[in-house]
């Protein structure tokens, strides 16, 4: 979380940006809060990235005023007009691209005043890992796959009855590069499981956490999924 | 001087419409949102709902999603609230207030009676 | 909807004392807090917005406090045109919400 605060002439108001990610092919949400001003008209929003030249996003009068926008967000950014009225000046970032990873300043001017933060947004691709029963394999046999993770994750497999254990010996990880030669699929399989007993594959890096979680008894297999983005910190 | 002028008293049938007209300064209208809070006899403030004729954007509390239509006419710097499908519950005073996110003016008030 | 409570519901005060009255939040507003005077008959007025800021020509002795789901407002030494209900209102997300209101009365 950070917290940027106004400087000189008018009282600086506070505006409050949380650190993110993005998932590379889909839209993402750069988060950036303000306090709410009545008078709607004053209300100009602008978005900027560190390195770029153009302006990011820029909302003034109560519409987007995009003649000084860069062109590397084109058609791809939004705020969302009903919820400026609440403070809320996020940004919505349509087909994430790689190089819009960076340092991104939130500037508002209200008629209160002027206030700015800056916001950390990583890129990467991250998603849900499945686990299933390996029927084709000559033992037991667990299959985690996850379809899209850059950049390359660790995998690492745990077990409920035998907390603590390196199953790295019985387990193998690949990684197959995607058609847009970007991301890539995860696959690990993971041998010798015994029955009554709960697996996870935990896949990760430094934008996001995963666990496919699966139980298998002799009537029943139970499956759970699970996503975390990390450093998703406020300034 | 911010006025906010509202249309008088009503008294309506159970299942008909209602609407309340409020009429502000030009410089209000471009500026500000416009919202729409009632109070039943002896009860609390209610918001019902709000439009920002500068974000083109409207907003209803879910309670009246679906009966509550505000609009607003720029021409006129007019905003409308109509409330359909009425009941003796809808029974109250209705004021336009200047804002959201909070309201700094207030219309009048306009008593609405739903009754048979 | 963030739903909010205001306490107590009514509150019996001599002129020239100090009142001071709650409104509670069921989730964060940070400071996105407002209240509202009304009188019998009358529309209800702005007092306080950001939590602590007055609005225009409201006195000093009218003041506003708190952050998150907490707030206050202080009327110190009460005159006998503060005799009135007080609402609070949340505007951190919609719906804005309002409190069920304090009826401030002279003791």
């Known amino acids: 979380l950070i917290i940027g605060f106004g400087i000189s002439g008018r009282h600086s108001i506070t505006v409050t940006t949380v650190a993110s990610a993005g998932n590379i092919g889909e839209d993402g949400i750069l988060s950036c809060t303000f306090e709410p001003d009545i008078k709607l008209s004053d209300i100009v929003i602008q978005w900027l990235k560190e390195g770029v030249l153009g302006l990011v996003h820029e909302f003034k009068e109560g519409k987007d005023e995009l003649s000084e926008q860069d062109e590397m967000f084109r058609g791809r950014t939004a705020v969302f007009a009903d919820q400026v009225i609440v403070g809320n000046a996020s940004l919505r970032l349509k087909n994430v691209q790689l190089t819009d990873a960076g340092t991104y300043k939130c500037y508002i001017i209200t008629s209160k005043g002027k206030g700015n933060a800056n916001l950390e947004y990583k890129t990467g691709a991250f998603s849900m890992p499945e686990v299933n029963v390996d029927y084709n394999a000559s033992s037991e046999t667990l299959r985690c796959e996850a379809p899209r993770w850059f950049p390359q994750p660790t995998v690492v497999w745990a077990s409920q009855v035998d907390q603590g254990a390196n199953f790295s010996e019985v387990s193998n990880t690949s990684f197959e590069l995607n058609s847009e030669n970007v991301t890539m699929k995860v696959v690990s399989v993971l041998y010798n499981v015994t029955i009554n007993n709960t697996y996870s594959c935990m896949i990760e890096n430094d934008i996001a956490k995963a666990t496919g979680d699966i139980k298998v008894t002799e009537s029943e297999i139970k499956r759970r999924s699970h996503l975390q983005l990390l450093n998703s910190k406020a300034s | 001087q911010v006025q906010l002028v509202q249309s008088g008293a009503e008294v309506k049938k159970p299942g008909s419409s209602m609407r309340v007209s409020c009429k502000a300064s030009?410089?209000?209208?471009?500026?500000?949102?416009i919202s729409w809070v009632r109070q039943a006899p002896g009860q609390g403030l209610e918001w019902m709902g709000g439009?920002?004729?500068?974000?083109?954007?409207?907003n209803y509390a879910q309670k009246f999603q679906g009966r509550v239509t505000i609009t607003a006419d720029k021409s006129t710097s007019t905003a409308y609230m109509e409330l359909s499908s009425l009941r003796s519950e809808d029974t109250a005073v209705y004021y336009c207030?200047?804002?959201?996110?909070?309201?700094?003016?207030w219309g009048q008030g306009t008593l609405v009676t739903v009754s048979s | 909807e963030i739903v909010m409570t205001q306490s107590p519901a009514s509150l019996s005060v001599s002129p020239g004392e100090r009142a001071t009255l709650s409104c509670r939040a069921s989730?964060?507003?940070?400071?996105?807090l407002a209240w509202y005077q009304q009188k019998p008959g009358q529309a209800p007025r702005l007092l306080i917005y950001?939590?602590?800021t007055r609005a225009t020509g409201i006195p000093a002795r009218v003041s506003g406090g708190g952050s998150g789901t907490e707030f206050t407002l202080t009327i110190s030494s009460l005159q006998s045109e503060d005799f009135a209900v007080y609402y609070c209102?949340?505007?951190?997300?919609?719906?804005?919400?309002f409190g069920p209101g304090t009826k401030l009365e002279i003791k």
């Open positions: 207030a200047r804002g959201g996110p909070y309201f700094d003016y």
């Open positions: 030009e410089d209000t209208f471009s500026s500000y949102a």
């Open positions: 439009t920002a004729p500068i974000f083109g954007t409207t």
């Open positions: 989730q964060s507003v940070s400071s996105n």
């Open positions: 950001g939590a602590s």
């Open positions: 209102q949340q505007y951190k997300n919609w719906p804005f919400t």
